[in-house]
Interface confidence: low
């Protein structure tokens, strides 16, 4: 058969939960301390909460059935009677009473024809302000007759026909009634919730609703123009040109900021937005939802997208509606011909209308922002340049911040990209130019996206002119080639000599993408003498071992994930892993990761890696070779190899360093 509507699915779930109590029994959730009852969906059933309030489960006859004395459940179908009597069956006795007062209406409800009545519950009538009720029952009850006729449709309409966003023609001056049928199974009629639906009568159907509904005369724009509390909003809408949309056809929800909401924002910020057509349009669009959302439809947190594209979390807490967890809705369900308005007393400023400063203030990067300000870069973060700010997380600075000197200023300038980027468009190998004049590289890995040594730690925040990338560490731009890096650090003097001996200098100086696991002098000194002599006595073997320390792509620590098998220039793979923030290669910890170079990255290690073929199965007693013996071997080898003869002085240097 046809797909069930959300309402029918929820009813089916309630029936399922109630079946152990007999046929046609529905489980109903009642909010403790209120008379609010709901057929229960799966999520609510397990959470036992509606709008954050605890509920109790009761079991009632499903719509259209009744109990039979002495029998389990609700085995009997309710007898069909006319509409007037069915009002009594559903408990809408006040509607019956007011129908009697009109004189004309009862004969209609008892007579031939086919009608639908959206009947307010007794509580709904009782909650009307006294002056409203008085006005209904005065004037020879003509107002009452009109009001009741507005609750009626001149044909039978069952819930499976009540589609989201449809309008029904009422029996009062053919005025429209707005229907919304939400995915959670809640159905509203002019934002009044259907409590008991589809009660058949011989001449139609009765739906019990939780409010007395009234005609809708104004569109959203007209309501904005009438209400004093929307003075600022009115000016903003006029300036943005959105009034055409807000007075046109469609179904929108306007989260309408009151004057008070605008007053909470500093004038400078507000006027920056009001004076910027694009930011203003984004601001206003962030208060508009693409469909009408009545308050009664919200029974738990719900993600909704605004016209601006931002996702808002609409929820509820008791009787209060919340936006992003805050109870800022002061007046709800003001109906318009083209949607619904909820008054809010706090402005929802989207990222797209914010400066970089404002974006950063809401992120975990305040320490970095202070540094940018102290370094005199504040103007870039609040101006109209198209920029991307690479801001390290506060946790990066847990051990303190650097002094603001020329070096730090330059470093910070290299955290600002001269373009407004979006991470989703970044690609591997892309270069980005900084305010400091550096070219930074983009590395795309399976589970991370990195710029040089620093990886993106949170979703981008795209502002009016600038985008904020939250980064997991301070970014260090490359200062030279891998060879330059190694030569410039006296921890690697022995490695540099070995690289020169092995003829790999040119490789590590030219353009390329290398990951170099760089053993320190200590690592070389720690080699068993036999290994050391073997290494230094054979230029080919030395080259082989050193190539095993060089991966054929750039792998920064943020790109490792759990385990990466990195192909080395020697041919075998290196097992690189990250555990508890410690990088390891072949299970040996890296002492210092991510020293960036223009043609690669250097990771400092305190041991020399052995390719699989070279790893001894067991280490017996090695010869306690002295440095002199190693040198003899190197010299002997050099006589057999012209290339080694050329490099003998380098070996000598290497051996001399090993003595110390």
């Amino acid at each position: 058969g046809p797909a069930k509507s959300p309402y029918q699915l929820v009813l089916q779930h309630s029936r399922l939960r109630g079946r152990q109590h007999g046929p046609n029994v529905c489980a109903v959730q009642k909010v403790i301390g209120t008379n609010r009852k709901y057929f229960t969906n799966c999520k609510q059933w397990y959470q036992r909460k509606i709008c954050g309030k605890s509920t109790v489960i009761s079991y009632e006859c499903c719509p259209g059935y009744e109990k039979v004395p002495g029998e389990k459940g609700c085995p009997a179908a309710l007898p069909l009677s006319n509409l007037y009597e069915t009002l009594g069956v559903v408990g809408s006795t006040t509607t019956q009473l007011y129908t009697d007062r009109t004189e004309k209406l009862r004969p209609e409800m008892e007579g031939p024809g086919s009608f639908t009545i959206f009947a307010p519950s007794n509580e709904a009538w009782a909650s009307l302000p006294a002056e409203v009720l008085d006005s209904l029952v005065s004037n020879v009850n003509i107002e009452l007759l009109n009001a009741l006729r507005y609750h009626m449709v001149g044909r039978r309409v069952l819930t499976d026909e009540l589609k989201h966003g449809m309008t029904l023609t009422s029996m009062y001056q053919n005025s429209n009634i707005q229907i919304h049928h939400y995915p959670n199974g809640i159905v509203t009629v002019n934002c009044a919730r259907l409590l008991k639906a589809d009660h058949h009568a011989t001449n139609g159907v009765v739906h019990l609703i939780d409010k007395v509904i009234s005609t809708i005369t104004n569109n959203i724009q007209q309501i904005i123009e009438i209400e004093d509390t929307f003075e600022t909003l009115r000016a903003a809408v006029a300036a943005s040109g959105l009034n055409t949309m807000l007075e046109g056809n469609g179904q929108y929800t306007l989260l309408a900021p009151t004057n008070e909401a605008f007053e909470k924002i500093p004038s400078e910020t507000l006027n920056r937005i009001l004076g910027d057509p694009e930011a203003l349009r984004d601001l206003l669009n962030n208060h508009i939802l693409k469909s009408a959302m009545c308050a009664e439809a919200i029974v738990a947190g719900l993600s909704v997208e605004t016209l601006e594209g931002t996702t808002l979390e609409v929820g509820c807490s008791g009787d209060m509606l919340t936006i992003n967890g805050k109870a800022i809705i002061s007046n709800k369900d003001i109906l318009a011909t083209n949607g619904v308005i909820h008054y809010i007393d706090e402005l929802l400023i989207p990222d797209s209308a914010k400066t970089l400063f404002e974006l950063a203030a809401e992120s975990d990067v305040s320490t970095a922002i202070d540094l940018f300000r102290q370094a005199g870069l504040g103007n870039h973060l609040s101006g109209s340049e198209r920029l991307t700010l690479l801001a390290p997380l506060n946790s990066v600075f847990k051990d303190g911040t650097p002094p603001i000197d020329a070096h730090t200023r330059n470093l910070l300038r290299n955290h600002i990209i001269k373009d407004q980027l979006a991470s989703k468009y970044l690609y591997h190998g892309q270069t980005l130019e900084t305010l400091g004049g550096k070219k930074l590289r983009v590395f795309v890995y399976r589970n991370s996206l990195c710029i040089e040594n620093s990886c993106i730690a949170a979703h981008d925040k795209r502002g009016r002119y600038g985008t904020l990338f939250t980064m997991d560490r301070v970014l260090t731009p490359p200062m030279g080639t891998v060879m330059d890096v190694l030569k410039g650090d006296n921890r690697f003097s022995m490695l540099v000599a070995a690289i020169q001996s092995a003829g790999l200098t040119e490789t590590l100086n030219r353009e390329g993408v290398y990951t170099v696991f760089a053993p320190t002098n200590e690592a070389f000194r720690a080699l068993p003498p036999r290994e050391r002599s073997r290494l230094l006595g054979d230029a080919k073997e030395l080259a082989n071992i050193l190539k095993y320390h060089i991966g054929d792509e750039i792998l920064v620590s943020g790109g490792i994930g759990a385990l990466v098998r990195l192909k080395s220039l020697q041919g075998d793979k290196l097992e690189v892993s990250l555990k508890n923030n410690v990088v390891s290669v072949n299970k040996e910890p890296v002492a210092e990761p991510d020293i960036m170079a223009t043609n690669g990255v250097v990771h400092v290690i305190t041991n020399v890696l052995q390719p699989p073929a070279n790893r001894p199965q067991e280490r017996g007693d090695e010869l306690a070779d002295s440095a002199l013996e190693i040198f003899k071997q190197a010299s002997a080898f050099s006589r057999a190899s012209q290339r080694s003869v050329r490099l003998a002085p380098v070996y000598q240097k290497l051996l001399e360093r090993m003595k110390h």
Epitope: S267, N271, G275, T355
Partner: antibody
Framework: QVQLVESGGGVVQPGGSLRLSCAAS????????MYWVRQAPGKGLEWVAT????????YYADSVKGRFTISRDSSKNTLYLQMNSLRAEDTAVYYC?????????????WGQGTTVTVSS | DIVMTQSPDSLAVSLGERATMNCKSS????????????LAWYQQKPGQPPKLLIY???TRESGVPDRFSGSGSGTDFTLTISSLQAEDVAVYYC?????????FGQGTKLEIK
Amino acid sequence: QVQLVESGGGVVQPGGSLRLSCAASGFTFSDYYMYWVRQAPGKGLEWVATISDGGIYKYYADSVKGRFTISRDSSKNTLYLQMNSLRAEDTAVYYCVRGWDRYDSWFASWGQGTTVTVSS
Amino acid sequence: DIVMTQSPDSLAVSLGERATMNCKSSQSLLYSSNQKNYLAWYQQKPGQPPKLLIYWASTRESGVPDRFSGSGSGTDFTLTISSLQAEDVAVYYCQQYYRYPYTFGQGTKLEIK
């Protein structure tokens, strides 16, 4: 350099009206927020009204709301303050002030002021 | 409305000495989204219009001598003249531009002792 020259001050009876003008030069008038600030004799400064660069947004102190109207004519580089239903407490030197930039801000440049005396 | 209160009402300082005056707002002028304080300081000499000295609570307007400095955050602010000169005799006003209506302090009159 920025020049702001106020005119239109004078003596007026309570209930009367005056229109102050401020001729601006030395900057692009249409790019700046403009303000009127007043100072009663021997007293402190009081902000009176603001107008945005495009003239859309106007703000008034409660003490003048409904009686004073701020406006601007960018073709003439002139700021105006129409003052109706004047009261004795409106007696003050009225300064024409330029904002810092095209956004609402602090009071960056001040004219020499024009004196308004409301007296019977 | 945000009320601005300056202290002292008047201040007499010897030439070359440090002059310090305070300004307190009835609510915070620090906007968390950009970490800026919406406060300005002005100097008014007799018979002249006010002149902008400081904005954002601590940023000196160009052309203002560096003996003038502003400090403070939130609700408490200070204007300091590190070495008083004869031409500094004036009334000094603080002003908030965090929220309309923009309001000034009542002023601090600075004289030479």
